[in-house]
Structure formats: structure tokens, C-alpha cells
């Protein structure tokens, strides 16, 4: 499993992982105590046939070509959690590992 | 976690799982001994904001709105394997559990 990494200067048109810092403060999400911001990353780019396909299923659907099936799209294929300290809405503060907050790899599915 | 299930008569425009039988024989894939066909299913439909989003990350990227980020797309969020009997190209016949061959659930990511 591998995926492309790009940045804002890249000319890559294919499915790629780009850097993105999410700033909770800028969103006005004051219920999040920590972190104030974190590196989330995101996926963008084109999914030509077979390029970076995560699943054999993607290839099979392309072959079968059913009504209404779109081509594969560039989406996270590997994600990781971050630890957050936050108000849970019941006057409690919770420390928790929140899953799927960081994109580690992008692919076509 | 949940996802919508549709069929060919559905009028649902949102991200949905549709039935699809993959027929290896029809593809001419004679190196697959069994199964000859199986229910693979596929995902199709629109991903309006927040609907069936699998990850909190999807919502955060929408908020941050970086250059070139497409909206979320309708893609498998839960998949399962099938057992297959096949020629492996080295004159051997293999029985194996092939991952991610069946779409169990669709969502927006």
C-alpha cells in the first residue's frame, strides 16, 4: 500500500495527500481544550482507472459498469487518531483518542 | 454507523449501497475456479454536507475548505472478504480469503 504526497506547489493531478492544518479556534469550537490545531491533511486529485486503487472490488465494479456507478474517487485509505481534551456537553471534560482524524494515505475507491 | 440500501427501482439520490453481482465468467476470468459469480454490491449517489459522513475528518476538511478539496464522495465504508479458489499464475491452485470484495456499507468520505 502506498500513496502520493503533494504540497501546494505540486503539479500532480492524480489522487494525492495534501497538508492541511485544522484550527479549532478559527472554527469557534471552544469546547475543544486541546489541541488548538492539528495536522489533518486531505485527499484531492483524479482517479484514473487502476491508479492507486485500494480494493480489488473497485476494479470489478469498473468492469461490471452498473447503472449509476461513478468512477473511483480520491479518498482516505489510511487514517489515524489524535488525543483530544474536550467538554462533552454534560459539564464534564474528557480525554479521548478520537479515531480517523488524520489522513495518512490517500487512494482511489 | 449505518448506511442506506437501495435497489434498481429506488428513487434515492443520496449515497446508497446497490446490489451488484460480479460474474467472473462474463469477464472471461477463467483463472478463477470458484465462485463463478458473487454479490459484490457497489456505492452510488450524492454526498450532501454531513450526510452519512464516516469520519469527523470529512467535516473538518469541509470547514477548512482548502484549495482543490472536492466534497466527500460515496464510497465503501465497510467491506468484507470472500473465499476464492483460483490459479495463481504459477500453475498452482490457491484457496484464499480475498479481502474487501463485498461492500457491506456505503458512506461519504
Amino acid at each position: 500500500d502506498f500513496g502520493l504526497d503533494c504540497d501546494e506547489h505540486s503539479t500532480e493531478s492524480r489522487c494525492c495527500r495534501y497538508p492541511l492544518t485544522v484550527d479549532f479556534e478559527a472554527f469557534g469550537w471552544d469546547w475543544i481544550i486541546a489541541p488548538k490545531r492539528y495536522k489533518a491533511n486531505y485527499c484531492s486529485g483524479e482517479c484514473e482507472f487502476v491508479f492507486l486503487q485500494k480494493y480489488p472490488h473497485t476494479h470489478l465494479v469498473h468492469q461490471a459498469n452498473p447503472r449509476g456507478s461513478a468512477g473511483p474517487c480520491c479518498t482516505p485509505t489510511k487514517m489515524s487518531p489524535i488525543n483530544m481534551l474536550y467538554f462533552n456537553g454534560k459539564e464534564q471534560i474528557i480525554y479521548g483518542k478520537i479515531p480517523a482524524m488524520v489522513v495518512d494515505r490517500c487512494g482511489c475507491s | 454507523d449505518f448506511g442506506l440500501d437501495c435497489d434498481e427501482h429506488s428513487t434515492e439520490s443520496r449515497c446508497c449501497r446497490y446490489p451488484l453481482t460480479v460474474d467472473f465468467e462474463a469477464f472471461g476470468w477463467d483463472w478463477i475456479i470458484a465462485p463463478k459469480r458473487y454479490k459484490a454490491n457497489y456505492c452510488s449517489g450524492e454526498c450532501e454536507f454531513v450526510f452519512l459522513q464516516k469520519y469527523p475528518h470529512t467535516h473538518l476538511v469541509h470547514q477548512a475548505n482548502p484549495r482543490g478539496s472536492a466534497g466527500p464522495c460515496c464510497t465503501p465504508t465497510k467491506m468484507s472478504p470472500i473465499n476464492m479458489l483460483y490459479f495463481n499464475g504459477k500453475e498452482q491452485i490457491i484457496y484464499g480469503k480475498i479481502p474487501a470484495m463485498v461492500v457491506d456499507r456505503c458512506g461519504c468520505s
Epitope: 471552544d30 469546547w31 481544550i33 486541546a34 489541541p35 459539564e91 480525554y95 483518542k97 | -
Partner: antibody, heavy 116, light 107 residues
């Protein structure tokens, strides 16, 4: 340099009220949650309250809930603790602290004595 | 409420000694454990957060480890300015609670 300066402590009778203040400087006050922690003479540390950066969310332990109210004025870079129905067991040095994953900066504290 | 138990409650050590303080939580708290140092008449100072992350400006002789219920603060080579009381604190869920403290004295 982060600085937190508490004030408002003093001697108060049981059942009385007191309002503590914490003046913050050296960081963007409105960006951080803030906490109060107290320490009874010769004893350990006890968490008293926390407020979110915008002031929308608060949390308290049962020992002070309903009697103490934390608030903040981001335009004045000041944190407050309104203490009502004070008891002898509330006697302590009260510290304000800048809150991140942990309380990463503390003031020098202000002494509150509840006694008749 | 989550109870935090520190041990020992006090210890005597010499300059240059390796010192270990332990903290045990009454239930699993993941890595939501912080360590503070307090000198007489002074405010506490954060040393370690999230079990093992060194706070900015804190000397590298301080280190933290552990997850779940058992945690350790280690001072690799005790310095004269390290004689103080050390507290652990859980930030896993409110009410946040502190250990009873460990007083590190000069032998």
C-alpha cells in the same frame, strides 16, 4: 512571558461570599481554557473549576458545584471565581492556571480564609 | 471519581541520584497523566504532560512513562534545585484529581 496574577482573597465568615480575579498577560487569553485549583494549608492540590476559551462551557467537582461560578472577560484578559456559601473547608490558596492538555502555567495564588 | 495514589509519600536522596516516583490510577486513564513540581510557598510547575511529553523549558533529566493505570516520573540525576514536592494529576475525566504528593528531601 506568560503571567497570571490572582487577587481578591482574604478573610471571610462562613456563609459569606468572595470573588477572585486572575489577570492574564503574555499570551492570547481568549484562545485558551482556564482553570482554578486550590491548596488547603499543608495539604495537596484540588481542582476547582475549568472554563472553555470562549466561556461557553464550564466544569466543577461536586465539592463546589452550585456554590462556585467560574467566568471570564476576554476583553479584559481576566478570569473570575465567584464563591458563595463559603465553608471552613474552602480555606486554601487559590491558583488560576492556563489550561492545555495540562495546566501549563500557574499564578502565584491568593489566600482565602473562611473563619468566624 | 478516579483516585490517584502516589508512592512513596517522601524520599531522601543525594545530588546525582536517580529518583523514581510512581503514580497509580484507580482505573485506566490512557495517557492522560501530568506531573507537577512544587517548591514551598510557590505555585506548581508543569513538568510532564500526556504521560511522557516534556513541557517546554523543563530539563531533559525529567522523564515520564506509563499508560493505563501505572505511571512513573524519573529524575535521571537529581540536582539541588529538584528538592521539592511532586504531584501527579489525571486529566482523563472530570473531576480531575491529584495524587497526594511525593516530597523529595536531601539525604
Amino acid at each position: 512571558e506568560v503571567q497570571l496574577l490572582e487577587s481578591g482573597g482574604g478573610l471571610v465568615q462562613p456563609g459569606g461570599s468572595l470573588r477572585l480575579s486572575c489577570a492574564a498577560s503574555g499570551f492570547t487569553f481568549s484562545s485558551y481554557a482556564m482553570s482554578w485549583v486550590r491548596q488547603a494549608p499543608g495539604k495537596g492540590l484540588e481542582w476547582v473549576s475549568t472554563i472553555s476559551s470562549g466561556g461557553s462551557y464550564t466544569s466543577y467537582p461536586d465539592s463546589v458545584k452550585g456554590r462556585f461560578t467560574i467566568s471570564r472577560d476576554n476583553s479584559k484578559n481576566t478570569l473570575y471565581l465567584q464563591m458563595n456559601s463559603l465553608r471552613a473547608e474552602d480555606t486554601a490558596v487559590y491558583y488560576c492556571a492556563k489550561q492545555d492538555y495540562a495546566m501549563n502555567y500557574w499564578g502565584q495564588g491568593t489566600l482565602v480564609t473562611v473563619s468566624s | 471519581d478516579i483516585q490517584m495514589t502516589q508512592s512513596p509519600s517522601s524520599l531522601s536522596a543525594s545530588v546525582g541520584d536517580r529518583v523514581t516516583i510512581t503514580c497509580r490510577a484507580s482505573q485506566s486513564i490512557s495517557t492522560a497523566l501530568n506531573w507537577y513540581q512544587q517548591k514551598p510557598g510557590k505555585a506548581p510547575k508543569l513538568l510532564i504532560y500526556a504521560a511522557s511529553s516534556l513541557q517546554s523549558g523543563v530539563p531533559s533529566r525529567f522523564s515520564g512513562s506509563g499508560s493505563g493505570t501505572d505511571f512513573t516520573l524519573t529524575i535521571s540525576s537529581l540536582q539541588p534545585e529538584d528538592f521539592a514536592t511532586y504531584y501527579c494529576q489525571q486529566s482523563y475525566s472530570t473531576p480531575w484529581t491529584f495524587g497526594g504528593g511525593t516530597k523529595v528531601e536531601i539525604k
